[in-house]
Interface confidence: low
């Protein structure tokens, strides 16, 4: 099929970075500035993406590949190929229609993006809360209350390391 196609289509041998120019008897012409073709046999070149405003250029456009954008500091990418930039928030916050808002009690966000998520419910796994959650951090679940009952063996955590020459307070 490919051989048949190439016999029928004089444009099929135009390589990536060029286009088959119908205005010049279908010879291969290089893509004009600020355009590209990533595959051979193209009848037109695509316009390069321009990383403007909140977008910044991560990879320049070439004759064979489109530019790639990311977001300026204070923003992060959303969507395929970074089609949108969304404002960062602080840890412990989420972005709403009214801007960055603190996570509600019982929820946390440990990133500058995304939504606040509920703390882990330790009791669902039969465990107890070892470290309370905050707006920025999830709770830390510890051993189950049964594991801590008298007579049950428990692993003693290692003593914190101290610098030599310092006695315990």
């Amino acid at each position: 099929f490919e051989r048949t196609r190439s016999l029928q289509d004089p444009c099929s041998n135009c390589p990536a970075g060029t286009f088959c120019d119908n205005n010049r008897n279908q010879i291969c012409s290089p893509c004009p500035p600020n355009s590209f073709s990533s595959a051979g046999g193209q009848r037109t070149c695509d316009i390069c993406r321009q990383c403007k405003g909140v977008f910044r250029t991560r990879k320049e456009c070439s004759s064979t590949s489109n530019a790639e954008c990311d977001c300026t500091p204070g923003f992060h990418c959303l969507g395929a190929g970074c089609s949108m930039c969304e404002q960062d928030c602080k840890q412990g916050q989420e972005l709403t229609k009214k801007g960055c808002k603190d996570c509600c009690f019982g929820t946390f966000n440990d990133q500058k993006r995304g939504i606040c998520r509920p703390w882990t419910n330790c009791s669902l796994d039969g465990k107890s809360v070892l470290v309370n959650g905050t707006k920025e951090r999830d709770v830390v679940c510890g051993p189950s209350p049964a594991d801590l009952s008298p007579g049950a063996s428990s692993v003693t955590p290692p003593a914190p390391a101290r610098e030599p020459g310092h006695s315990p307070q």
């Epitope: 321009q50 403007k52 405003g53 909140v54 977008f55 204070g74 923003f75 959303l78 089609s83 949108m84 930039c85 969304e86 404002q87 960062d88 928030c89 972005l95 229609k97 009214k98 801007g99 960055c100």
Partner: nanobody, 121 residues
Framework: EVQLLESGGGEVQPGGSLRLSCAAS????????MGWYRQAPGKRREFVAA???????VYAESVKGRFTISRDNAKNTVYLQMSSLRAEDTAVYYC???????????????WGQGTLVTVKP
């Protein structure tokens, strides 16, 4: 009704400074992103700077380090402080209300009428 009223334009010598203001009304100012654009004679309108509801800012490469965008939510006003002005900064400067805080190449929902800045010796 959304209204954007620019002021502060004028004639200034190269190296000089100007402060443009854009007084906004008719919408909830503090939760919206605002931008400044400019159009030089015979050229297309181009992005200059934007400021988002959280006060994050973005600048065109050509004005970085010389222009500063700021906002006063209490006064519903956005400002463009321009310094080290050059002849190529001569243009009509437009205030724009951007579409939300999620931005795809800042798209403008509403424009002001513009204020002329002329930089010449």
């Amino acid at each position: 009704e959304v209204q954007l009223l620019e002021s502060g334009g004028g004639e200034v010598q190269p190296g000089g400074s100007l402060r443009l203001s854009c007084a906004a009304s008719g919408f909830s100012f503090s939760i919206n992103a605002m931008g400044w654009y400019r159009q030089a004679p015979g050229k297309r309108r181009e992005f200059v700077a934007a400021i988002y509801s959280g006060s994050s800012t973005v600048y065109a490469e050509s004005v970085k380090g010389r222009f500063t965008i700021s906002r006063d939510n209490a006064k519903n006003t956005v400002y463009l402080q321009m310094s080290s002005l050059r002849a190529e900064d001569t243009a009509v400067y437009y205030c724009g209300l951007l579409k939300g805080n999620r931005v795809v190449s800042p798209s403008v929902a509403y424009w002001g009428q513009g204020t002329l800045v002329t930089v010449k010796p």
